[in-house]
């Protein structure tokens, strides 16, 4: 349940984090799972524990195995397992699947490739980046902090990207490499006739007289950035601004969200101190874009 796979190459540094949550003040004990033998905390050892972290400086193939970490928190001890595999260095350029971190996707607008696991290490910029084992050169590639940015991404930028950096521990330097695949996706947006998610058409909302209530108008308009997409409330067919009732206010600005890639917009109508006359009004949620206008009506009724 609380097990995490970690891998590295022989003669490189590998740092593994305990897969259980900890706090800086809580001791973490590390053990070789097979022997139950405690892992030392002294930094003179090649393999040593340092709080939440288990450090192999450098790693050897024989280090492969399962390691147990126990977070000594009050109330309950939290136990986790790190499944570590150390591989021999590959003679050729090919990086096998078992050494690959998760694939990332990019597009013309967003082409960041983060160097996997780098946050665990004590490294200094710059990172070195390679694509299919070739060092990346040219102004299109920018190594920025812990990620690579590619300008004007094209489909042939897809491939395996390796980051290489130096981990420093007490003045000693250790090399680390990590590889992940990068795929390029076509970010084609589209626009469609608005779909109102809330309220349902001809919905009735129960309210209590004297209480405050909020009505949310939420609609989706397509995928990606939209040229025109607006939602608003009307009262009896009139704009809120034309309806001189200070108790009833439409939220300033519109909250834009991307739900499952869809461009959706919300606006909230706030009614303070609900009065009997508010029950007689017709509240229209309007969603408008270049394809047209959709309207859903909601009325208020007194809570029994």
């Amino acid at each position: 349940k609380f097990s995490k796979q970690s891998w590295g190459l022989e003669n490189e540094a590998l740092i593994v984090r305990c897969p259980r949550q900890g706090k800086s003040s809580y001791i973490v004990d590390w053990y070789y799972s097979q022997t139950n033998k405690s892992i030392p905390t002294q930094e003179r050892n090649r393999v040593f524990a340092s709080g939440q972290l288990l450090k192999f400086l450098p790693a050897e193939v024989a280090d492969s195995g399962i390691y147990t970490c126990i977070v000594r928190s009050p109330t309950f001890n939290r136990t986790g397992y790190a499944n570590v595999t150390i591989y021999k260095k590959q003679p050729d350029c090919n990086v096998p699947d078992y050494l690959m971190y998760s694939t990332v996707s990019g597009s013309e607008k967003n082409s960041k490739i983060y160097c996997p696991t780098i946050d665990l290490y004590n490294w200094t910029a710059p990172l070195e980046w390679f694509k299919n084992c070739q060092a990346l050169q040219g102004s299109r590639y920018k190594a920025h902090k812990s990620f690579l940015v590619i300008d004007n991404v094209m489909t042939d930028d897809a491939g395996d990207y390796t980051c290489k950096f130096i981990h420093n521990e007490n003045g000693a330097n250790y090399s680390v490499t990590a590889t992940r695949s990068f795929t390029v996706k076509d970010e084609q947006g589209f626009s469609r006739f608005p779909v109102i998610r809330a309220p349902a058409h001809n919905e009735t909302k129960e309210v209590e007289i004297g209480e405050n209530t909020n009505l949310t108008c939420s609609a989706c308009f397509g995928k990606g950035a939209q040229f025109l997409a607006t939602v608003q409330w009307q009262l009896n067919g009139n704009k809120i601004t034309d309806f001189s009732e200070p108790r009833i206010q439409q939220e300033e600005g519109q909250n834009q969200s991307f739900s499952n890639g869809l461009a959706c917009v919300n606006t909230v109508l706030r009614i303070a101190d609900v009065k009997e006359e508010d029950l007689l009004l017709r509240y229209d949620c309007l969603a408008l874009n270049l394809h047209g206008l959709r309207r859903h009506t909601i009325r208020l009724s007194r809570k029994n």
Epitope: K1, F2, K23, S24, S25, I27, P74, T75, F76
Partner: antibody, heavy 123, light 111 residues
Framework: EVQLVESGGGLVQPGGSLRLSCAAS????????MHWVRQATGKGLEWVSS???????YYSGSVKGRFTISRENARNSLYLQMNSLRAGDTAVYYC?????????????????WGQGTTVTVSS | NIVMTQTPLSLSVTPGQPASISCKSS???????????LFWYLQKPGQPPQLLIY???NRFSGVPDRFSGSGSGTDFTLKISRVEAEDVGVYYC????????FGPGTKVEIK
């Protein structure tokens, strides 16, 4: 306002089942360990079960194998499924908040308690 | 299991007078993080327990300063400098070093 509201208590026959719920509001539920504590009429407080932020579960010896604690972070809810109930399980069951794992220094014990829900096991 | 004991089990106090409750644990409540996991609660009639003191001596927010906690290791004390009518109820000590255990409670009433 930080609040815990228990529900689901009632009268049940020995051997029966009941599911208690606790609705949390006013805080980031997912970052806290959560617990159930019970109190029989006129008696002291007894810890029953706990669930940590990562879903690991813990039980007192008297309920182990019969009770199951669970949480649904998306609904800000804590549950206690009680099976094979006995007369000795009759008590007020309190839902209570424990350690906050998003705050490195935070540990106020069981700092927030619900009003409790009454479970009566009787034939 | 850590066992908690409290003395006295009941206490009758004159308003304005001090009161003291003792709590002992079967083993030290000092954790490797340097903190001691001992708490005091007050349960007023018909209400859930409310936290008074955490970490032996820290007053929880909103708790009047007439309440104070002290102690270390296995021996702890809750003191009320001047008892008020609203202080009646049952006082529990609790440890959370290993799971949770409560003391049997001390019933405080006004003379």
């Amino acid at each position: 306002e930080v609040q815990l509201v228990e529900s689901g208590g009632g009268l049940v026959q020995p051997g029966g089942s009941l599911r208690l719920s606790c609705a949390a509001s006013g805080f980031t539920f997912s970052t806290f360990d959560m617990h159930w504590v019970r109190q029989a009429t006129g008696k002291g407080l007894e810890w029953v079960s706990s669930i940590d932020t990562e879903g690991d579960t813990y039980y007192s010896g008297s309920v182990k194998g019969r009770f199951t604690i669970s949480r649904e972070n998306a609904r800000n809810s804590l549950y206690l499924q009680m099976n094979s109930l006995r007369a000795g399980d009759t008590a007020v069951y309190y839902c209570t908040r424990g350690e906050d794992w998003s705050d490195d220094d935070y540990y106020y014990g069981l700092d927030v308690w619900g009003q409790g829900t009454t479970v009566t096991v009787s034939s | 299991n850590i066992v908690m004991t409290q003395t006295p089990l009941s206490l009758s106090v004159t308003p304005g007078q001090p009161a003291s409750i003792s709590c002992k644990s079967s083993q030290s409540l000092l954790h490797s993080d340097g903190k001691t996991y001992l708490f005091w609660y007050l349960q007023k009639p018909g209400q859930p327990p409310q936290l008074l003191i955490y970490g032996v001596s820290n007053r929880f927010s909103g708790v009047p300063d007439r309440f104070s906690g002290s102690g270390s290791g296995t021996d702890f004390t809750l003191k009320i400098s001047r008892v008020e009518a609203e202080d009646v109820g049952v006082y529990y000590c609790m440890q959370s070093l290993q799971l949770f255990t409560f003391g049997p409670g001390t019933k405080v009433e006004i003379k």
